[in-house]
Structure formats: structure tokens, C-alpha cells
Amino acid sequence: SGTTNTVAAYNLTWKSTNFKTILEWEPKPVNQVYTVQISTKSGDWKSKCFYTTDTECDLTDEIVKDVKQTYLARVFSYPAGNVESTGSAGEPLYENSPEFTPYLETNLGQPTIQSFEQVGTKVNVTVEDERTLVRRNNTFLSLRDVFGKDLIYTLYYWKDSSTGRKTNTTHTNEFLIDVDKGENYCFSVQAVIPSRTVNRKSTDSPVECMGQEKGEFRE
């Protein structure tokens, strides 16, 4: 028990990558707990993370139901134990999050180069089509399934021996580029959604170089 009053949550922040979506907030609770609710603009409020002492709540299960909807969350503060509440007229304290539209705002996760194959002076570079937590007909969709042609990949490549980078883009997950015979090249890719105004680009993938295990070479 105690007399510390319940305080409202603040700094509500969406953290989302490839639709894995977590709401974070402050403060760390002292003599209080939180329950989170999430809603679409036209929908009903659904409670999650009941009576928690965490300052984050995984809302992925809710947002993947329709990633093109705009969501709003709110965090309720309740007194723990026999602590007074500051809510007026018995109303619980809560704070609203900013709006969040997963399709437009989720961060693009760091891509991975799945493989590259050299045939003569051509190299085929394949980007792993990462699985998301978005479902359709009980199967998880890939990033490409969700974004379709809105998603492009940019390939950065350079000769092992030089610093000059070249670029190439694709609306699929594969690149076919020309290389100089007998030269080793290094590759890095980046996911991009050109139509976005925020979170347009992912971080670059780890660099992969020819002569390492991911490559195949055929004359």
C-alpha cells in the first residue's frame, strides 16, 4: 500500500519492423500497472497486455489483421495494491498514442543476400524474401507478398579491389548484372519503398563478396 498517485503514461512510441509492431511508453511503473487498448479509426477498442508492469506491448497480432488500416492505441494506468488513483470521477487515466499505419510506416528490416551465381560475365544476385507476420489463408506472407510492386531493392556492387560503387534496382528479388571476367565483386542490397514519405529505406544488408560460400560460379 501507499499514497503515491497513479500517473499517466507518456512518450507513447510505435516501434515496428517488417510489421512486427511494439508500442513503448514511459514511465517505469511505481505502484501502478498498465493495460493497452488498440483500435482502428472506425473499429472498437481491444485490450491487450492486461495489468502489466512492462512498458511495452506487442500489438503485432492486431495490426497484421489489416496492415493498411490506421491504428490508434491508448495506455491505461491503474493503481497497484491499495494506492490512490488520480483519475477524475473514477475515470481511469490514459494516454493516446500517435496514429500508426503499418503499411506506410513499418520499418523495412535489413535485407539478406540469399545467393549469387556467376555465369560468364553475368551475376545473378538473389535477395531473401523475408517472411512477415502478416497472414493470409493461414500462411505467413513474405515482404514481397505484402508490398508487391511498391517494394524495390537497390543493389550496390563493386570490384573487390576498388572503391567505386555501382547500383542497380529491381522490382523483384533478383538482379542480373554484368561483371568483368576474372574480377571478384562485393554486393550489398537495400530495400526501398519509393512512394513513402517516411521510413523509405532499410539499412544495407551485410556485404557478401564473390569467392565466399554464398556464391556459385559457372563458366
Partner: antibody, heavy 121, light 107 residues
Framework: QVQLVQSGAEVKKPGASVKVSCKAS????????MHWVRQAPGQGLEWMGI????????VYAQKFQGRVTMTRDTSTSTVYMELSSLRSEDTAVYYC??????????????WGQGTMVTVSS | DIQMTQSPSSLSASVGDRVTITCQAS??????LNWYQQKPGKAPKLLIY???NLETGVPSRFSGSRSGTDFTFTISSLQPEDIATYYC?????????FGGGTKVEIK
């Protein structure tokens, strides 16, 4: 099997306190919330509050705020509900009930057998 | 607090009849509603969670549905062992609240 076993019936005088125990077995005690629900004779069910056994954090219905205290003993997988300043309206059967898994976090999937508390002068 | 208005408060039906109980929430509670069965002198038993999901081991003659703030609990074919009081319970808002109960009897 999963079960909750509660302490026996109590008769108390107005103004006194009562402490009811609920011993859990057959599952990992710390992984499930425990709730207390009461039922006055011939009446419906009334939620009193919740305790998280892993951290001991409690949340009470405002109606019972200041009069109820829920505690737990992880060494014996037991939760306790103490109600003070008893009055005749507190005469009821008191149940502990386990909160379900994450799928149904606030559905009460396992119940104790109930403890009858009679408040009479 | 959220009020859960359950109706009817009691009903009498014949074995094999379809029995329907409704619960209306005083405000939107999403699908955060559970149904319990309580037989005389016994603790309640969870039948349906999240408005329409059947708890493991519960006979399929029991079902639940939602339309907005109205929730329906149905026994498709009443059996003698279904004599009990049935309660709805919402958990979308603190504090958790129950409906007043519906007593089901056999004609």
C-alpha cells in the same frame, strides 16, 4: 492435474478480518494471474481483484480498495486474500480463479472450490 | 464500470430445445467476453472465451457469437446436465464485470 484448493469456511464478527488461502498445483504457478471472485448467497459473481504471482503485483476493484490485500507465497504456490473491516454484506462464497493463458488472459479457466465466509454478530 | 445486462434472468425449456441467452454491454467491449456455467453448490466453469471460442473439453452444443455490443450464448440442444446458471463476463475494461446470470431449468 491442475487444481486450486481453498481453505475452509470461516465465521467472523463485524469489524474483523478474514484471510482465505488458495493453493495451486499441476501447473507453473508464476505463469498465470490469479483472480478473486465472490458470490453472495443467491446472487451473481463479483470480481474483487487480481494478483500476478511472478511479481506479486496486485490490482483491486475500486469497491474493495483499502479493505482487500492479496498476497502470494511462491514457495508453496499459494495465494491469499485478506478482507478487513468485515460487514454483513461481505457474507459470501469467495473463489480464487486462475487467469487463462495469453490466448485468453482474463478468462477464468480453473476455479477453487470456494470458501464460505459468514459475517455475523 | 461496464454494465453487463443479461437476459432473460431465468428460462424453462424442454430437453432438446435450442436455448439462447443474451448479454448486452453498456459500451463497446470488442470480443472480450467469456461465458461460464455454474451448477448449484459448485464453482463456475469456463465454457466460451473471446465471445466465440469453445474452451477445450466443452461440448460443441455450446456456442457464442457477437454483434456489436450484443453477445449471444446458445445451447443447440438442451440436455438434462445443462441445468445451471450461466454468466457472461467482460474483460475489456477495468474492473472486470459479470452479467447478472441466467438460470436455466428443464420444463
Amino acid at each position: 492435474q491442475v487444481q486450486l484448493v481453498q481453505s475452509g469456511a470461516e465465521v467472523k464478527k463485524p469489524g474483523a478480518s478474514v484471510k482465505v488461502s488458495c493453493k495451486a498445483s499441476g501447473y507453473t504457478f508464476a505463469n498465470y494471474y490469479m483472480h478473486w471472485v465472490r458470490q453472495a448467497p443467491g446472487q451473481g459473481l463479483e470480481w474483487m481483484g487480481i494478483i500476478n504471482p511472478s511479481g506479486g503485483i496486485t490490482v483491486y476493484a475500486q469497491k474493495f480498495q483499502g479493505r482487500v490485500t492479496m498476497t502470494r507465497d511462491t514457495s508453496t504456490s499459494t495465494v491469499y486474500m485478506e478482507l478487513s473491516s468485515l460487514r454483513s454484506e461481505d457474507t459470501a462464497v469467495y473463489y480464487c480463479a486462475r487467469g487463462g493463458s495469453k490466448v485468453a488472459a482474463l478468462a477464468f479457466d480453473i476455479w477453487g472450490q470456494g470458501t464460505m465466509v459468514t459475517v455475523s454478530s | 464500470d461496464i454494465q453487463m445486462t443479461q437476459s432473460p434472468s431465468s428460462l424453462s425449456a424442454s430437453v432438446g430445445d435450442r436455448v439462447t441467452i443474451t448479454c448486452q454491454a453498456s459500451q463497446d467491449i470488442s470480443n472480450s467476453l467469456n461465458w461460464y456455467q455454474q451448477k448449484p453448490g459448485k464453482a463456475p466453469k469456463l465454457l466460451i472465451y473471446d465471445a466465440s471460442n469453445l474452451e477445450t473439453g466443452v461440448p460443441s452444443r455450446f456456442s457464442g457469437s457477437r454483434s456489436g455490443t450484443d453477445f449471444t450464448f446458445t445451447i443447440s440442444s438442451l440436455q438434462p446436465e445443462d441445468i445451471a446458471t450461466y454468466y457472461c463476463q467482460q474483460y475489456n475494461f477495468h474492473p472486470l464485470t459479470f452479467g447478472g446470470g441466467t438460470k436455466v431449468e428443464i420444463k
